[in-house]
């Protein structure tokens, strides 16, 4: 069954945390639907963004942070692991210097950390996706 | 009630149609969240666009046309008359040389006819709203 | 064994221009973010800019945004602040540090750093 | 004025307990790295990402961090521990800043 879009979550992230979500884009890419992660400060959708990834189907993932209510310098990636039409599986790892984004068990993009990972209260999925799946693992200490 | 985002539906427009729409974003505008409506010549998705809507609540509205399965030049404007977190009414009226867009009863953008509007065979209403109104009306014969 | 030699420091007058040089070697060079910082006489550490290690990102502290600009050539191994519309604060010795990180990140360490280099602002 | 305030001078007998603050960041969010520098040479890292040592540096050397302080410990001061300390952290995390410095005396 489908989880409602923008889905919000509370969440705690560390070192070892991975955020995993599944779903599929709502268009074509000829049509350039996105997907959007946030990883927020605070539980309100205006927080500060420790960690923003936005999926422009078909074309490009640009990376950022939202600081003070500003854009930090944007990070862009070219990769386009998604496929047209197709479910697609991404998951986050908090590792030690840096995020790491794999899509569909490869490892596609990486961002490093700018801010604190424990900073993170509040994880947000948007845009024009269907949602199957979000699920927050915790590393067992 | 809610309609289904994306929504489509199969339309026929001439000078003297109107389209009304009426929704919400789903997001704050310092989030960016779009809107965006699309008049197609075929029913499928991936079909050329005869007039490209596009908002992004807070900054700009961008428009076009996609020929041939290109996008053309396009037309942006920063008009912004859409207001944070408030409903909003847009009506697309053909006129005769042009569309002619308002936002909650204003004229607000104007976009010159590329195509005929009778090549207009759907139209999509997308991206991050939630939307309560959809009509077309047609000029009586 | 790793080293970072700055080069280019002197005497200016005010409003005019001078041109740094870090020289690094012992290290992979085009793997780590470079920072800039300076030390004015008998004062503390004052940061001044920072380079990604691909040198696209790009940072400056508020006492030098839009006089000063941070450059890098990794095939050069270098590392450049081209300073312009100098002014006697701007009196110090100049560092070049090395990152931990590839990318600027406040507070994550710079773990080597140069001897340093003087600029004086004077007429 | 620095954005981050350090104590200009903290004493310590040799053997002892040194502990430098470091107030007025916002320590929840961005990470904090501590320098020492002696008198005519560069600054050499002794703590970074709050509580992280780069290798080579002494395990009486501590940091931590906890709202809008950050904290570095010398556990058993010894004499050549006599040096200035600077705290540095970020006012965003692409722009970095030093606190005042503290002198550090070992008695």
């Known amino acids: 069954s489908l989880l409602p879009v923008p889905y919000t979550e509370a969440a705690s992230l560390s070192t070892g945390s991975t955020v995993t979500i599944k779903g599929r884009p709502l268009a074509c890419f000829l049509n350039e639907p996105y997907l959007q992660v946030d990883f927020h400060t605070e539980m309100k959708e205006e927080s500060d963004i420790v960690f923003h990834f936005q999926v422009c189907f078909g074309r490009r993932v640009v990376m950022n942070s939202r600081e003070y209510g500003a854009w930090k310098q944007q990070v862009e990636s070219k990769n386009m692991p998604f496929q047209d039409g197709q479910e697609f599986e991404l998951s986050i790892s908090v590792l030690p210097d840096k995020y790491q984004v794999m899509v569909n068990g490869q490892s596609s993009y990486t961002f490093d950390h700018r801010i604190k990972p424990e900073a993170v209260k509040m994880v947000q999925v948007w845009r024009d996706i269907s949602l199957t799946k979000f699920n927050v693992s915790y590393l067992k200490r | 009630s809610l309609l289904p985002v994306p929504y489509t539906e199969a339309a026929s427009l001439s000078t003297g149609s109107t389209v009304t729409i009426k929704g919400r974003p789903l997001a704050c505008f310092l989030n960016e969240p779009y809107l965006q409506v699309d008049f197609h010549t075929e029913m499928k998705e991936e079909s050329d666009i005869v007039f490209h809507f596009q908002v992004c609540f807070g900054r700009r509205v961008v428009m076009n046309s996609r020929e041939y399965g290109a996008w053309k030049q396009q037309v942006e404007s920063k008009n912004m008359p859409f207001q944070d977190g408030q409903e909003f009414e847009l009506s697309i009226s053909v006129l005769p040389d042009k569309y002619q867009v308002m936002v909650n009863g204003q004229s607000s953008y104007t976009f010159d006819h590329r195509i005929k509007p009778e090549a207009v065979k759907m139209v999509q209403v997308w991206r991050d709203i939630s939307l309560t109104k959809f009509n077309v009306s047609y000029l009586k014969r | 064994e790793l080293q970072l030699v700055e080069s280019g420091g002197g005497l200016v007058q005010p409003g005019g221009s001078l041109r740094l040089s870090c020289s690094a070697s012992?290290?992979?060079?085009?793997?780590?973010?470079m920072n800039w910082v300076r030390q004015a006489p008998g004062k503390g550490l004052e940061w001044v800019s920072g380079v990604n290690s691909g040198g696209g990102l790009t940072s400056y502290g508020e006492s030098v945004k839009g006089r000063f600009t941070i450059s890098r050539d990794n095939a050069k191994n270098t590392l450049y602040l081209q300073m312009n519309r100098l002014n006697p604060d701007d009196t110090a010795v100049y560092y070049c540090a090395k990152s931990k990180r590839g990318a600027v990140v406040a507070g994550t360490g710079d773990d080597y750093w140069g001897q340093g280099t003087q600029v004086t602002v004077s007429s | 004025s620095s954005a981050l305030t350090q104590p200009s001078a903290v004493s310590v007998s040799l053997g002892q307990t040194a502990r430098i603050t470091c107030q007025g960041g916002?320590?929840?969010?961005?990470?904090v790295s501590w320098y020492q520098q002696k008198p005519g040479q560069a600054p050499v890292l002794v703590i970074y990402?709050?509580?992280e040592r780069p290798s080579g540096i002494p395990e009486r050397f501590s940091g931590s961090s906890s709202g809008d302080t950050a904290t570095l410990t010398i556990s058993g001061a010894q004499a050549e521990d006599e040096a200035d300390y600077y705290c540095?952290?970020?006012?965003?995390?692409?722009?970095?800043?030093f606190g005042g410095g503290t002198h550090l005396t070992v008695l």
């Open positions: 540095q952290s970020g006012s965003s995390s692409d722009n970095a800043v």
């Open positions: 990402k709050d509580s």
């Open positions: 916002n320590f929840g969010r961005y990470y």
């Open positions: 012992g290290f992979t060079f085009g793997a780590y973010a």
